[in-house]
């Protein structure tokens, strides 16, 4: 009778066994017979593993509704954080191998990074397993001994071999017991790994006339392996071909003296075994997929498929994916994988160029012709930076644009003793009628009374300062400084412009009498104004310092 | 909402140890791990270490040389820093801090920081 | 341990200014694993943004993040007054995890 629950297929057998164990006991028992916690890479390994799981189950005589977890090999190391971008979230193989595409969890997994995770497979041991219902993967702690976790009921092993032999060919009566090198013994194998060791013993089984062979798996010749037996075993002319196909692989002939023959159809050929037929070409049925090619084994025994470049074999050898050439970090900054390659692409502000493959080169942005600024910029790594000159500010959604200040509504208060008329970057000052701007180009002085428009500066006029002029412009944010040679009283910032190219008009007559001192008017009651800070109020009016921008439109911005 | 309360300032003398608490409320407390920063007046943020309240495991700086011991109390959602053996160089403000739901341990909830000062 | 230095350690800028901030690591670190934090006087840090260029819930557009490596960049595309504090980034690789030295920020 089998000791446990084995299945072997492709180049791996899978043993399931119970046991209320850490992930790390079980492990150790597996590495003890040469094999690690079972991966499940693919959905056919799923299978694999779950059929071996529906083996164990079946031999457990009354199951309880309750579910049970199974260790496999996938565990998360302390210190390494849950990934979400990865479909194995961070998690690797026991064995190593690569991240695999396949996976099946359960649900949202708890998002850590100290402790020691790993996976088990969930079942519902009151039920039957069917195939169409792969078993969930469940994240937890790894237990520790005599604490394994909570509905630990056993592990899954997997033993990789370099092949398998098929299972000897029974002609006539008798039990074929297989020995495999992970200490398991079983009589029925769909496929037997390499050195394991086979006892027939042929008979009825309660007769004395039964007789014993054993045959070892070995390597015949490259990825070609067999038992070294020759013919089917346990033949008697009593039963000819009507016992089990006379152990033939495909046809079986029989002679008139009770002896009979393998054979194979049309396109197979009879191996040295003389029971098992191989195609002649095995690539006739098409065994590879997803884009790979099949190329024939020796003597037309066996094939391996081969994949384009840029692309792998899977776990199952027959099937190509994508090689994630990123995960090698070709590229300087950032990596694109495509199907069957990858693009190397550079950040924004960088651009493909400088030494090696992949490389990237700072964009000057500042370069001339393509500066995105409207006024100053200066080249970063990687970016770029806007400024603006005296008289301006950043602004726009991606601060590249320059605004003007408005230097007659700032937050200093009045900048001129009287008018004030805001212009592109700057600023400057008039007087009221019967008034003329004094040198500092700020205060006005009492002058001849006129009924003319409000008066501009002497002949010669004041500029505001500009960067790289011999007077230093003040601070915004202090609003003292006068005008250099004057005393620090006027409320101004910067020194205004004055142009005699623009000249001060569209200010109404009729409300430009002077009335005390020049910084003291009635308020037009079409104007809109901006108060003036500290001023006195005359009787009878509103103190407002007027304001008129250069285009001819009156009031603030 | 996740809210971290911390307890509140101490003053203990070089030699002493001190232990401040952070009580979590607001999600499930075993399913965060819990980390401890601190910052010394004028200097920059340090990660001290960090429990996981589900399994106990801890992850400590080795900057601290086994002077520093983390605990939970998951029937109170409470996480414990015990800091020993301590200098004036250990005066700071200490946080307890998690990552909830984001990844990659980014520390998204903050407490509001414990500040411990250590005078003779 | 990864050293994660961060440059200028202090800057003045301008209401509307675009600000960049650089932190190097001394050894390669995974853009998941790298983040931004603003912290206040007296006040705990806040994140802004993680894993390289995600903003974190509630944090304003002007924030952003990219790099890759050991060269990270966080920018504030136009500068508020509320920006005032000091800037981390913070990297994990293993332990310890480690912040940068921090970038004082000031309004002219």
């Known amino acids: 009778a089998d000791t446990e629950a084995v299945v072997c297929a492709g180049t791996a057998c899978y043993t399931a066994h119970w046991g209320k164990l850490s992930a790390a006991e079980a492990q150790n028992l597996c590495l003890q017979n040469g094999g690690n916690l079972a991966t499940v890479k693919s959905e056919e390994e799923a299978q694999h593993v779950q059929q071996v799981l529906a083996q164990l189950l079946r031999r457990e005589a009354a199951l309880t509704a309750r579910m049970g977890k199974f260790w496999i090999g996938l565990q998360r190391e302390k210190g390494k954080c849950l990934d979400p971008s990865l479909p194995l979230k961070g998690f690797s193989w026991v064995g190593g191998g690569e991240d695999t595409p396949y996976s099946n969890w359960h649900k949202e997994l708890r998002n850590s990074c100290i402790s020691k995770r790993c996976v088990s497979l969930l079942l519902d041991l009151s039920q039957p397993l069917l195939p169409g219902r792969l078993p969930k993967w469940s994240e937890g702690p790894c237990g520790s001994p005599g604490s394994p976790g909570s509905n630990i009921e056993g592990f899954v092993c997997k033993f990789s071999f370099k092949g398998m032999c098929r299972p000897l060919a029974l002609g006539g009566p008798g039990q074929v017991t297989y020995t495999t090198p992970f200490q398991t013994t079983s009589s029925s194998l769909e496929a037997v790994p390499f050195a394991s060791a086979a006892n027939v013993a042929c008979g009825e089984g309660d007769k004395d006339d039964s007789q014993s062979h054993y045959f070892l798996c070995k390597e015949k010749a490259p990825d070609v392996f067999d038992w070294g037996s020759s013919g089917p075993l346990c033949v008697s002319p009593k039963y000819g071909c009507n016992f089990n196909n006379g152990g033939c692989h495909q046809d079986c002939f029989e002679g008139g003296d009770g002896s009979f023959l393998c054979g194979c159809r049309p396109g197979f050929r009879l191996l040295d075994d003389l029971v098992t037929c191989a195609s002649r070409n095995p690539c006739s049925s098409s065994p590879c997929r997803g884009g790979a090619t099949c190329i024939p084994g020796p003597h037309g025994k066996n094939y391996t498929c081969r994949c384009p470049q840029g692309y792998q074999l899977d776990s199952s050898q027959l099937d190509c994916v994508d090689v994630d050439e990123c995960q090698d970090s070709p590229c300087a900054q950032e990596c694109v994988n495509t199907p069957g390659s990858f693009r190397c692409e550079c950040w924004v502000g960088y651009e493909p160029g400088g030494p090696g493959e992949g490389a990237c080169q700072d964009v000057d942005e500042c370069a001339l012709g393509r500066s995105p600024c409207a006024q100053g910029c200066t080249n970063t790594e990687g970016s770029f930076h806007c400024s603006c000159e005296e008289g301006y500010v950043l602004a726009g959604e991606d601060g590249t644009q320059c605004q003007d200040v408005d230097e007659c509504v700032g937050p200093g208060g009045p900048l001129c003793d009287s008018l004030c008329f805001n212009t592109q970057g700057s600023f400057r000052c008039g007087c009221l009628p019967g008034w003329v701007l004094a040198p500092n180009g700020v205060s006005c002085a009492m002058g001849p009374v006129s009924l003319g428009p409000p008066s501009g500066p002497p002949d010669e006029e004041y500029k505001g300062e500009r960067e790289g002029s011999t007077v230093p412009p003040a601070a915004t944010a202090s609003p003292t400084r006068g005008p250099e040679g004057t005393p620090k009283s006027t409320p101004t910032t910067r020194r205004p412009l004055l142009s005699s190219d623009a000249p001060i008009t569209s200010v109404p007559l009729e409300v430009l009498a002077p009335s005390g001192s020049p910084g003291l008017w009635r308020e037009p009651s079409i104007h809109h104004t901006t108060a003036a800070s500290g001023a006195q109020e005359p009787a009878g009016g509103d103190s407002s310092v007027a304001t008129q921008n250069d285009d001819g439109t009156d009031g603030q911005k | 909402q996740v809210q971290l309360v911390q307890s509140g300032a101490e003053v203990k003398k070089p030699g002493a140890s001190v232990k401040v608490s952070c009580k979590a409320s607001?999600?499930?407390?075993?399913?965060?791990?819990m980390h401890w920063v601190r910052q010394a007046p004028g200097q920059g943020l340090e990660w001290m270490g960090g429990i996981d309240p589900e399994t106990g495991d801890t992850a400590y700086n080795q900057n601290f040389k086994g002077r520093v011991t983390m605990t939970t109390d998951t029937s109170t959602s409470t996480a414990y820093m015990e800091l020993r053996s301590l200098t004036s160089d250990d005066t700071a403000v200490y946080y307890c801090?998690?990552?909830?739901?984001?990844?990659?341990?980014?520390?998204?909830?903050w407490g509001q920081g414990t500040s411990v000062t250590v005078s003779s | 341990e990864i050293v994660l230095t961060q440059s200028p350690s202090s800057l003045s800028a301008s209401v509307g200014d675009r600000v960049t901030i650089t932190c190097r690591a001394s050894s390669s670190v995974s853009s998941s694993y790298l983040h931004w934090y603003q912290q206040k006087p007296g006040k705990a840090p806040k994140l802004l943004i993680y894993?390289?260029?995600n903003l974190a819930f509630g944090v304003p557009s002007r924030f952003s993040g990219s790099g890759s490596g050991t060269s990270y960049t966080f920018t504030i595309s136009s500068l508020q007054p509320e920006d005032i504090a000091t800037y981390y980034c913070q990297q994990y690789s293993g332990y310890p995890l480690t912040f940068g030295s921090g970038t004082k920020l000031e309004i002219k």
């Open positions: 894993s390289t260029s």
């Open positions: 607001g999600y499930t407390f075993t399913d965060y791990e």
């Open positions: 801090t998690n990552y909830g739901n984001l990844y990659y341990y980014a520390m998204d909830y």
